[in-house]
């Protein structure tokens, strides 16, 4: 029961996380620009991975996409790649984990197969979450190091007057969405990996087994058969050792002075 709950919760947490990663990747507010009010209207400038937008205080908003790869920082391309890899891995992980869920029965799929699929999806979620966290962190670092403070010089020609305006980039909402979503996907992946351990067939060796001696001169042979939980390959308690050893299914033992228990 605990295993099913852990697996189910891991799936849900990962699902929310991946939805968040997709949302963050599509959002325009990865970075926002603090801008002074000009005499006409307050202008709010913000950028995403795919386009840049300007919103006026009147409500008018204009967004334009980055239609060229030239001029875009290499780091931005790297962030795009990390986020897309994270989404793809997460989507595949979700697909795999659906079939791995213990509460869903698909044909005669064994628990060992479900355990392997759960582990696979868990690893995918972990990598997906790490990709998202890495992407967002690279972007944040890029803002801090390259674009945090940008100085624009204003030249007025004939007057020879030079004015300097400081325009500052700050972290946009998408960064925080990305960090949280990446963390959730990572946690979900860890939960899936934990659930995998509980799903795996438990095999125990029982040392003490009834032996029926075939004759007076037969010496006691220590050992035993491999008892299975019923999920492994030895489902019918097949005889492992020969030479007088019998499983309870194969021969009925009656007490005698030659029986060793």
């Amino acid at each position: 029961m605990a295993v099913t709950a852990c697996q189910g919760l891991g799936f849900v947490v990962s699902l929310i996380g991946i939805a968040g990663i997709i949302a963050a990747t599509c959002m325009d507010q990865w970075s926002t620009q603090d801008l002074y009010n000009n005499p006409v209207t307050a202008v709010f400038n913000y950028q995403g991975l795919w386009r840049s937008c300007v919103r006026e205080s009147s409500g008018f908003t204009e967004c334009r996409g980055y239609f060229t790869l030239l001029g875009l920082p290499a780091m931005l391309q790297a962030v795009r790649a990390l986020m897309i890899v994270g989404i793809v891995l997460g989507a595949i992980g979700l697909l795999v984990s659906i079939f791995a869920l213990k509460c869903i029965r698909i044909g005669s799929m064994e628990d060992s197969a479900k355990a392997n699929m759960t582990l696979t999806s868990g690893i995918m979620f972990i990598v997906s979450g790490l990709c998202a966290i890495a992407g967002v962190s690279v972007f944040a670092n890029m803002l801090v190091t390259n674009f945090w403070m940008s100085t624009a010089n204003m030249y007025t020609g004939m007057g020879g007057m030079v004015q300097t305006v400081q325009t500052r980039y700050t972290f946009g909402a998408a960064l925080f969405v990305g960090w949280v979503a990446g963390g959730l996907t990572l946690i979900g992946g860890v939960m899936m990996c934990i659930a995998c351990r509980g799903l795996a067939p438990e095999e125990t060796n029982y040392k003490a087994v009834s032996y029926h001696a075939s004759g007076h001169s037969v010496a006691y042979k220590p050992g035993g058969f491999k008892a299975s939980t019923g999920f492994g390959s030895n489902t019918k308690n097949k005889k492992i050792y020969d030479g007088g050893a019998r499983t309870e299914d194969e021969v009925q033992s009656y007490p005698s002075k030659h029986d060793y228990v």
Epitope: Q33, L35, N38, V40, T41, V43, N45, Q47, R51, S52, V54, E56, S57, S58, G59, F60, E62, R64, G65, Y66, G71, L72, P73, L76, F147, S150, A152, M154, Q163, V165, T167, Y169
Partner: nanobody
Framework: QVQLVESGGGLVQPGGSLRLSCAAS????????MTWYRQAPGKGLEFVAG???????NYADSVKGRFTISRDNSKNTLYLQMNSLRAEDTAVYYC???????????????WGQGTLVTVSS
């Protein structure tokens, strides 16, 4: 970079009219706001009129009712129609654009070299 070139200035009699133009060129991604400023001899820079891409416009009290600002977004050009000119309107008129040279870059202020308007009889 964004380059701004003003034109249309000159000598005009009081009560006359002039039309100033400001053409933006270069690597332009977005120009949300374009503004006219002026600097009279021996004085500081004074806001005249401005217009945003969304159509919001604003005028200095001294020019309200006499000057009309407009812009052609497709040509990235700013206009200032000046009517009923007075002697106190004599100044160098500067075009200002709040623009980004590329989408990834922050919005910055770009200025033209200015055009001289002289109102004299």
């Amino acid at each position: 970079q964004v380059q701004l070139v003003e034109s249309g200035g000159g000598l005009v009699q009081p009560g006359g009219s002039l039309r100033l133009s400001c053409a933006a060129s270069g690597s332009i991604f977005s120009i949300p706001v374009m503004t006219w400023y002026r600097q009279a001899p021996g004085k500081g820079l004074e806001f005249v009129a401005g217009i945003s891409k969304g159509g919001t416009s604003n005028y200095a009290d001294s020019v309200k009712g006499r000057f009309t600002i407009s812009r052609d977004n497709s040509k990235n050009t700013l206009y200032l129609q000046m009517n009923s000119l007075r002697a106190e309107d004599t100044a160098v008129y500067y075009c200002n654009a709040q623009a980004s040279s590329f989408g990834w870059m922050p919005l910055s202020d770009y200025w033209g070299q200015g055009t001289l308007v002289t109102v004299s009889s």
